[in-house]
């Protein structure tokens, strides 16, 4: 059998190497960069995806690192340390021993320090606000149709339970999607809102992480919804700890 016939690939993560060397010759996939085994029936964690992205050849990366002064690093382009479950380690450091604390979506939440910096726990991002601007259309989308389509998208494409899509707001051309998921609400097996938001972000940018599943085909009553700008805001269960100097910059 050829590889194409066996089709040993990871539908939910193209940044993997797969081979039929699992139990009973079953397809087993490992994330690039970390070599960790991934569950291809659900989303891969953002930490493993970022690590895989950084391990790819530099010319394969199409996005530019945000400026050092960016308040929110939406792309999070650094080579993260992930724990054995694939989550971000609370403390991240670079090769020059500069360290900082991150939240559960890997976004920096403290000033940068040295190796003595302590990050006692991984603080959960429990509220994500995805702010979109869609391209001009003949008329505004019907709000309830738009709401239903986006909830469907998060449930069917990203496997996120509808209860975690708190609200969809719309004032043409701005769409806001609120995702909420407290530590107490997230059960084992639930997709994390941070992972769903990251997959959505990459889909919107035309950089789908799905293998062979095609790009995002987002339609409201048959009318294509094309996004021209995305901003993502993260709120943590514990407020971030930046110095006043950073806050007034």
């Amino acid at each position: 059998h050829t590889a194409a016939q066996d089709n040993c690939t990871c539908p939910t993560n193209k940044m993997t190497v797969c081979s039929p060397d699992g139990p009973g010759g079953r397809c087993q996939c490992r994330a690039l960069g970390s070599g960790m085994a991934v569950d291809c029936s659900t989303l891969t964690s953002k930490c493993l995806l970022l690590k895989a992205r950084m391990s790819a050849p530099k010319n394969a990366r199409t996005l530019v690192r945000p400026s050092e002064h960016a308040l929110v690093d939406n792309d999070g382009l650094y080579d993260p340390d992930c724990d054995p479950e694939g989550r971000f380690k609370a403390r991240q450091c670079n090769q020059t021993s500069v360290c900082w604390c991150v939240n559960s979506v890997g976004v920096r939440r403290t000033d940068k320090g040295d190796l003595s910096l302590r990050c006692d726990e991984l603080v959960r991002t429990h509220h994500i606000l995805i702010d979109l601007r869609h391209r001009p259309t003949a008329g505004a989308f019907n709000h309830s149709d738009l709401d239903a389509e986006l909830r469907r998208l998060f449930r069917e494409r990203y496997r996120l339970h509808p209860k975690f899509v708190a609200a969809v707001h719309y004032e043409q051309p701005t769409i806001q999607i609120e995702l909420r998921q407290n530590t107490s609400q997230k059960a084992a097996g639930d997709v994390d809102i941070g992972d769903a938001a990251y997959y959505f972000e990459r889909d919107i940018k035309g950089e789908s992480l799905f293998q062979g599943r095609g790009g995002l085909d987002l339609r409201v009553r048959g009318e294509p919804l094309q996004v021209e700008r995305t901003l993502i805001y993260y709120l943590d269960e514990i407020p971030p700890k930046f110095s006043m100097k950073r806050l007034t910059a």
């Epitope: 339970h161 997709v191 599943r213 095609g214």
Partner: antibody, heavy 116, light 108 residues
Amino acid sequence: QVQLQESGPGLVKPSGTLSLTCAVSGGSISSSNWWSWVRQPPGKGLEWIGEIYHDGSTDYNPSLKSRVIISVDKSKNQFSLKVRSVTAADTAVYYCARDNWGFDYWGQGTLVTVSS
Amino acid sequence: EIVLTQFPGTLSLSPGERATLSCRSSQSVSSSYLAWYQQKPGQAPRLLISGASSRATGIPDRFSGSGSGTDFTLTISRLEPEDFAVYYCQQYGSSPRTFGQGTKVEIK
């Protein structure tokens, strides 16, 4: 490898209640998937009955909603189907399936006949 | 409810031939939410294609899916003896999930 196995009586009397259970092995029911019931009358096509998430959230086919209850037992890694007030039209092969970008895993199906 | 109509109802072909099966939806379905299944007598359906074009694990590359909006196609490039079966399309983009009535691919 996820495996699903339906079990329950093969014969139910008219106006009675059809009860089936689907045991999930090789994977946890507490995953990001929904778990479905689908039926197929003899010689006919497939009809989706409804589905459940591990937290007990359900979604039913409106054509059957008034007669159907789907429940989950996480401790036993199984989910169940009850259809009340059955008639001969409910005679079918009943399948349980995992809903994960389409129904990617199915039980082998169990024939339930409604007859007195 | 989205109604899916499959045609032809029966397709009579010989092994080695190309099979083209169609599925039409009563309203627009995002291509992300369309699947195809194969069912043989006495067996459960088997997922072939999801997201209109993505082959499921273990499905041979002679099976391919395409389409968008209201028209979708399943193509079997060269029929093997084991491919003679009933094929169903299904949409999972809105509730209730619905199936087409099926296309039977039989040996000519």
